[in-house]
Amino acid sequence: LTCLGGFASPGPVPPSTALRELIEELVNITQNQKAPLCNGSMVWSINLTAGMYCAALESLINVSGCSAIEKTQRMLSGFCPHKVSAGQFSSLHVRDTKIEVAQFVKDLLLHLKKLFREGQFN
């Protein structure tokens, strides 16, 4: 049974599927939010360029006690090749300005939709 269980486990998720699922989660967050997302918590904004996924995770991982973004944090970790822990800012090259989590998620969502349309899945 143990061996058969191995056959049943899913293989790697295609990058296009993973990106689509992340976009869907961010859409879900933005649409279902009645109160301000994470009650106004501020995070470092990021450059939406190379290393964006790790930078996004490094910024969001510091927010605690906000269940609405826990799934997003987990999903972003799948896109980032290295382990990210709170207080780590190696991918946040410039700590320029802080924005509310709600704005951060909106900005990230717009950019990810653009990447998806352009077929940039990694």
Epitope: N39, V43, V63
Partner: nanobody
Amino acid sequence: EVQLLESGGGLVQPGGSLRLSCAASGFTFKSYGMDWVRQAPGKGLEWVSAIGPTGRDTYYADSVKGRFTISRDNSKNTLYLQMNSLRAEDTAVYYCAKEYTPFDYWGQGTLVTVSS
């Protein structure tokens, strides 16, 4: 329980100065970065400045760079914001915040009004 109490706001003329203070309690102040955030009448929250746990690392919004100075005294569990060359657009309620915490844990704020 995190408690933050801001003070030092008031009415000041354009070009004037104010120093805001924030007394912190209920957490190990010296271990956390801190933020100043403001909310102008009828507007959303705007991040103003941040400071690292030791006070060595400081960060500013472009709108206040060169005019505002953030500092902290870990022995007194107090955060400061020195505001110089104040402008009408700096009018807002100023909040201090333990970094990454929701506004439920912020102070009640202190009102700064810049007007002639």
